[in-house]
């Protein structure tokens, strides 16, 4: 059910492209294609290519993305395109100018001098942004989200975008300076992962991150469980980055117990993050237990 045909506007197309990209990434990383048949991988890649080609129709002259060509470009959507395309680089041919042009736009047009990334044209499909929705720590959460995307594009775009390392440092400085007084577990988790990627989740910041976990196994706020799955997935990625393998098993167990297999309305971020995190876990964790995750591969009829 994760392999779907992407379609629609610049936002809907990314909603459709997400589960296919992450499912292929997950099965590649965990070497599980034999279970489904390698021929299905080719079918899934065709769908990713289709999604990529369709997304280019929503690329603006500035290299940013929006739901429609005539709509003001969105910081969040552009960062999300960067994130998904960065992951898809190993799967299909992606023009680095498309990817790095978007990175350049984020840095030159949307980053303020204090490192914060601002959103001037929020997405229409608010359900696709996950825990960033109605977040009262928006500067921190959005900056962390964009920073993670930039770091995932770093190896691809460093040579083309000279300002990338400085932009990453500035955004990291902002997160670091404001981390200790965060209230929401979601923001602690997403900003924690962004800082961990930079090697900056240390000392008191690490204590803040670890002690925010409920029962040492989940990063949870009141409200939508989908957001808690997303937040805990970011936290798991941070723990793996930190090589904190003592803390990891209960977190993986909790994520597994949610029996969350992705798909469905409003699940874009939770789906992407849980499969990214669990793929990373199976790759990184020594002697990990096998995870029985239900990834069904029914290719859509043409």
């Amino acid at each position: 059910h994760l392999i779907v045909t992407p379609s629609g506007c610049g936002e809907q197309n990314m909603i459709g492209m997400t589960p296919t990209v992450i499912a292929v990434h997950y099965l590649d990383e965990t070497e599980q294609w034999e279970k489904f048949g390698l021929e299905k991988r080719q079918g899934a890649l065709e769908l990713i290519k289709k999604g990529y080609t369709q997304q280019l129709a929503f690329r603006q002259p500035s290299s940013a993305f929006a739901a429609f060509v005539k709509r003001a470009p969105s910081t969040w959507l552009t960062a999300y395109v960067v994130k998904v395309f960065s992951l898809a680089v190993n799967l299909i041919a992606i023009d680095s100018q498309v990817l790095c042009g978007a990175v350049k736009w984020l840095i030159l047009e949307k980053q303020k001098p204090d490192g914060v990334f601002q959103e001037d044209a929020p997405v229409i499909h608010q359900e696709m942004i996950g825990g960033l929705r109605n977040n009262n720590e928006k500067d921190m959460a959005l900056t962390a989200f964009v920073l993670i995307s930039l770091q995932e594009a770093k190896d691809i775009c460093e040579e083309q975008v000279n300002s990338l390392p400085g932009s990453i440092t500035k955004a990291g400085d902002f997160l670091e300076a404001n981390y200790m007084n965060l209230q929401r577990s979601y923001t602690v988790a997403i900003a924690g992962y962004a800082l961990a990627q930079m090697g900056r989740l240390k000392g008191p910041l690490l204590n803040k991150f670890l002690t925010t976990a409920k029962d040492k196994n989940r990063w949870e706020d009141p409200g939508k469980q989908l957001y808690n799955v997303e937040a805990t997935s970011y936290a798991l990625l941070a723990l793996l980055q930190l090589k904190d393998f003592d803390f990891v098993p209960p977190v993986v167990r909790w994520l597994n117990e949610q029996r969350y297999y992705g798909g469905g309305y409003g699940s874009t971020q939770a789906t992407f993050m849980v499969f990214q995190a669990l793929a990373q876990y199976q790759k990184d964790a020594p002697d990990h237990q096998e995870l029985n995750l239900d990834v069904s591969l029914q290719l859509p009829s043409r």
Partner: antibody
Framework: QVQLQQSGAELVRPGTSVKVSCKAS????????IEWIKQRPGQGLEWIGV????????NYNEKFKGKATLTADKSSNTAYMHLSSLTSEDSAVYFC????????????WGQGTSVTVSS | DIVMTQSPSSLAMSVGQKVTMSCKSS????????????LAWYQQKPGQCPKVLVY???TRESGVPDRFIGSGSGTDFTLTISSVQAEDLADYFC?????????FGSGTKLEIK
């Protein structure tokens, strides 16, 4: 302004337990970590552990696991440290402290609570 | 755990003199990703709680007189009082907050002649 007010001095018997309190005011209690530090007479400082009052999550120095238990009551903006199975080694001044700036150094401290373990 | 070693354990100085105290860590406190040393210096006057003087090895806490100067990087750190005053009579502790558990030096006691 930020203040941490600790409970008064305690004289307790060996083998018993004690609970030290730290009442916070002047800031959003649930947003900031509370650290606990031990200082024995004429000696240095030892980090016991930390509590996140918002989640109740804790992290301890291995040395104090089983000795100290940290809790927090959001309704009264108070953090607590429970010390069990007391011996003369536990006689010390105990401080609570918090980070309010982004220096990562503990910039606000309670006045300290003296615990004396004696028969 | 990171071990913090302070020296000297005590020193007596006259008002106006320059004071230097040392703190060494058993491993580097420099985070290469932000070029910051995770070290603080505290002053504890008799019967009081500790007070931050310097953080990130060399940044003076606001309100702290500029005669207090923190320096050093990696494993070797120094706190200098450029011209000691009578009110500086206190114990001085260094603390690393690079890794958990946080650890303190055993302190330097400053006495005024």
């Amino acid at each position: 302004q930020v203040q941490l007010q600790q409970s008064g001095a305690e004289l307790v018997r060996p083998g018993t337990s004690v609970k030290v309190s730290c009442k916070a005011s002047g800031y959003a209690f649930t947003n900031y970590l509370i650290e606990w530090i031990k200082q024995r007479p004429g000696q240095g400082l030892e980090w016991i552990g930390v509590i996140n009052p918002g989640s109740g999550g804790t992290n301890y120095n291995e040395k104090f696991k089983g000795k100290a238990t940290l809790t927090a009551d959001k309704s009264s903006n108070t953090a607590y440290m429970h010390l069990s199975s007391l011996t003369s080694e536990d006689s010390a001044v105990y401080f609570c402290a918090t980070y309010y700036s982004n220096s990562f150094a503990m910039d606000y401290w309670g006045q300290g609570t003296s615990v004396t373990v004696s028969s | 755990d990171i071990v913090m070693t302070q020296s000297p354990s005590s020193l007596a100085m006259s008002v106006g003199q320059k004071v230097t105290m040392s703190c060494k860590s058993s491993q580097s406190l420099l985070n290469s990703s932000n070029q910051k040393n995770y070290l603080a210096w505290y002053q504890q006057k008799p019967g009081q709680c500790p007070k931050v003087l310097v953080y990130f090895a060399s940044t003076r806490e606001s309100g702290v007189p500029d005669r207090f100067i923190g320096s050093g990087s990696g494993t070797d750190f120094t706190l200098t009082i450029s011209s000691v005053q009578a009110e500086d009579l206190a114990d001085y502790f260094c603390q690393q907050y690079y890794s958990i558990p946080f650890t303190f030096g055993s302190g330097t006691k400053l006495e005024i002649k």
